[in-house]
């Protein structure tokens, strides 16, 4: 009964830093309490971008100071992160965990690649 | 450098309380599920107890529901056990141990020892 | 609950030898939810893998992990002294955690 969670190989992000990917997962219960994790992999070592829980049915929510953005749906999760550069572009996973009720069930995708490209800076005019 | 460090572990009798601590440093505690697990002498791994980042979900083994309590404080980055109705059969090593971002169990403490006897 | 269980018991091998220990699941753990821990006596124990087959920070290349579904294995390519210890294995894709019982290494 593991879960299985899914989410795009690669992802290119804007010209302004902004990269969106869904992750969906299957659940193999019924929670009422979800926890969303984006974790950035970098060689080996592994850090949190972003976390939020949300209660089903209703809106994910982010920290106000969060990098991250994200809706939800059924067993789909619409998330955006921004502010990236250049040095940001790398393996980003998510993690899902059902909280409540048990059993809990963790959940980890294969990882998005994000490509992040900074823009070339405006020529000045005379 | 990131370290667990429990305390509280000792002699009690049958029926009685005892209350372990973990002092966790060098990493950012609520970000992180914390688990106590324990080894009975010359035995295996048996997992106990978690609790998860913000304190509100908790989970216990059969063996320990209802008598053990998990807590954190992630103000002063500590995790507790409180242990009541202590059995003979509770007598172990108690590790508190960091659940990793991707899962496993990453980081262990040196283990505090409880013996419950008459 | 799933159910770990290690073999053999006790692998009696010398240094320089392979050691290939195994931990079956009563039913599918996804590869991407099992450990293997290392425990010496007196220590607490030092995760090694995860993810089935990952090595952890610090964790020398004779040591390597596969299997998927209900089969894993840890294998030591060559047997250092400091080797000898108790090898578990651990799922933590679902509750309650667990862990087999345990295969210990020793020196022939």
């Known amino acids: 009964k593991a879960m299985h969670v899914a989410q795009p190989a690669v992802v290119l992000a804007s010209s302004r830093g902004i990269a969106s990917f869904v992750c969906e997962y299957a659940s193999p219960g019924k929670a009422t309490e979800v926890r969303v994790t984006v974790l950035r992999q970098a060689d080996s070592q592994v850090t949190e971008v972003c976390a939020a829980t949300y209660m089903m049915g209703n809106e994910l929510t982010f920290l106000d100071d969060s990098i991250c953005t994200g809706t939800s749906s059924g067993n789909q999760v619409n998330l955006t992160i921004q502010g990236l550069r250049a040095m940001d572009t790398g393996l980003y996973i998510c993690k899902v965990e059902l909280m409540y009720p048990p059993p809990y069930y963790l959940g980890i995708g294969n990882g998005t690649q994000i490509y992040v490209i900074d823009p070339e800076p405006c020529p000045d005019s005379d | 450098q990131v370290q667990l460090v429990e305390s509280g572990g000792g002699v009690v009798q049958p029926g009685r309380s005892l209350r372990l601590s973990c002092a966790a440093s060098?990493?950012?505690?609520?970000?992180?599920?914390m688990h106590w697990v324990r080894q009975a002498p010359g035995k295996g791994l048996e997992w106990v107890a978690v609790i998860w980042y913000d304190g509100n979900n908790k989970y216990y083994a059969d063996s320990v529901k209802g008598r053990f309590t998990i807590s954190r404080d992630n103000s002063k980055n500590t995790l507790s056990l409180q242990m009541n109705s202590l059995r003979a059969e509770d007598t172990a090593l108690y590790y508190c141990a960091r659940g990793a971002l991707l899962g496993a169990f990453d980081i262990w403490g040196q283990g505090t020892m409880v013996t419950v006897s008459s | 609950e799933i159910v770990l269980t290690q073999s053999p018991g006790t692998l009696s091998l010398s240094p320089g030898e392979r050691a290939t220990l195994s931990c079956r699941a009563s039913?599918?753990?996804?590869?991407?939810?099992l450990a293997w821990y290392q425990q010496k006596p007196g220590q607490a124990p030092r995760l090694l893998i995860y993810g089935a087959s990952s090595r952890a920070t610090g964790i020398p290349d004779r040591f390597s992990g596969s299997g998927s579904g209900t089969d894993f294995t840890l294998t030591i390519s060559r047997l250092e002294p400091e080797d000898f210890a108790v090898y578990y294995c651990?799922?933590?894709?679902?509750?309650?955690?667990?862990f087999g019982q345990g295969t210990k290494v020793e020196i022939k």
């Open positions: 651990q799922q933590y894709g679902s509750s309650p955690w667990t």
């Open positions: 060098g990493f950012t505690f609520s970000s992180f599920g």
């Open positions: 039913q599918s753990v996804s590869s991407s939810y």
